[in-house]
Amino acid sequence: MKVLQEPTCVSDYMSISTCEWKMGGPTNCSAELRLLYQLVFQSSETHTCVPENNGGVGCVCHLLMDDVVSMDNYTLDLWAGQQLLWKGSFKPSEHVKPRAPGNLTVHTNVSDTVLLTWSNPYPPDNYLYNDLTYAVNIWSENDPAYSRIHNVTYLKPTLRIPASTLKSGISYRARVRAWAQHYNTTWSEWSPSTKWYNSYREPFEQ
């Protein structure tokens, strides 16, 4: 039994790091493999992650981590029974993929404006909380040519769009994702999309 593609890991910088790897052949990941991880730190303890299958030869493990900070470095040992298949390390702060924003809501009762709001996926005491910026994707299923990305570079998780910039009488969808500039993260996954109907009509000219 051997590792074909070494584990690569990303951290949500809150409580979970996800490691994925590929084996040389079909493997029952949860029955045959264990990923041991330990913070390189005083009085830290070794933890065991039971991997799940991710396709025929792929495995994925969700490592639980507390109080993730920039100095943290973990040793990783991949075992098949008594055989050490791979040994490596992982620094969560250098491989951050933020959690996806949630609770995306569209408010159309604001005059002449479509207001989108969503929730920051981190609690206020998390390091990423004040570092997230967002990208909001708006598109229309009725008008396949229409798709826009709005970059939200301020902290407040809101976006205002003049209703007049959208076609009246058709439906739109929106989704949002996040990244953290100072931690040089990748983009989060997109949030679930939300749909609304743009009923705004330009007032008649007097």
Partner: antibody, heavy 116, light 111 residues
């Protein structure tokens, strides 16, 4: 909000032991390491050791090895620091502090006076 | 005896800027991250800066930190009388067994 409530002031004789408690609330107790540090009157801060509340593992500063014991009770979210063979130079304010590589939150401190 | 050296005292007038240095070595500041703590008279220390230059929520941006080589600096702008306190730098010794270190402390007086 996070609170670290420490036990009250103690007066001890040289050679005795003291046990200081630090009760945590407002966060997941087993998710954060707890440090102990002390500050002698008019002096700076001195690190004593650390406990991992999750499993109870400890690590102590070399200066206090053999004299200090840190324990925790997860049922009450409390950590304890016991210092034995007390001498006059152990007179200090003893702090518990939540954190790992740095110290996010501190208890108000417990004054331990060692005097014959 | 701490291996992180700070000036014993600094002073400045309200509204002014003051800096506090923290000098260490290659096995501590040079190979680790720096934090800063404020200790108001008669109270416990409070985290001001972590990760060399990051502020916890609730700490005003008048406080900033930087690190270069084996030394670090805390800067306080727009000094207020309420800033009068002792300030300590902190880092980790990485030479053998890792353990935290505190600086000697600096008393800030607002004139």
């Amino acid at each position: 909000q996070v609170q670290l409530v420490q036990s009250g002031a103690e007066v001890k004789k040289p050679g005795a032991s003291v046990k200081v408690s630090c009760k945590a609330s407002g966060y997941a107790f087993t998710s954060y390491y707890m440090h102990w540090a002390r500050q002698a009157p008019g002096q700076g801060l001195e690190w004593m050791g650390i406990i991992n509340p999750s499993g109870g593992s400890t690590s102590y500063a070399q200066k206090f090895q053999g004299r200090v014991t840190m324990t925790r009770d997860t049922s009450t979210s409390t950590v304890y620091m016991e210092l034995s063979s007390l001498r006059s130079e152990d007179t200090a304010v003893y702090y518990c502090a939540r954190g790992k590589w740095w110290f996010y939150d501190w208890g108000k401190g417990t004054l331990v006076t060692v005097s014959s | 005896q701490s291996v992180l050296t700070q000036p014993p005292s600094v002073s400045a007038a309200p509204g002014q800027k003051v800096t506090i240095s923290c000098s260490g070595g290659s096995s501590n500041i040079g190979n680790s991250y720096v934090s800063w703590y404020q200790q108001l008279p008669g109270t416990a220390p409070k985290l001001l800066i972590y990760d060399n230059n990051k502020r916890p929520s609730g700490i005003p941006d008048r406080f900033s930190g930087s690190k270069s080589g084996t030394s670090a600096t805390l800067a306080i702008t727009g000094l207020q009388t309420g800033d009068e306190a002792d300030y300590y730098c902190g880092t980790w010794d990485t030479s053998t067994t890792m353990y935290p270190l505190f600086g000697t402390g600096t008393k800030l007086t607002v004139l």
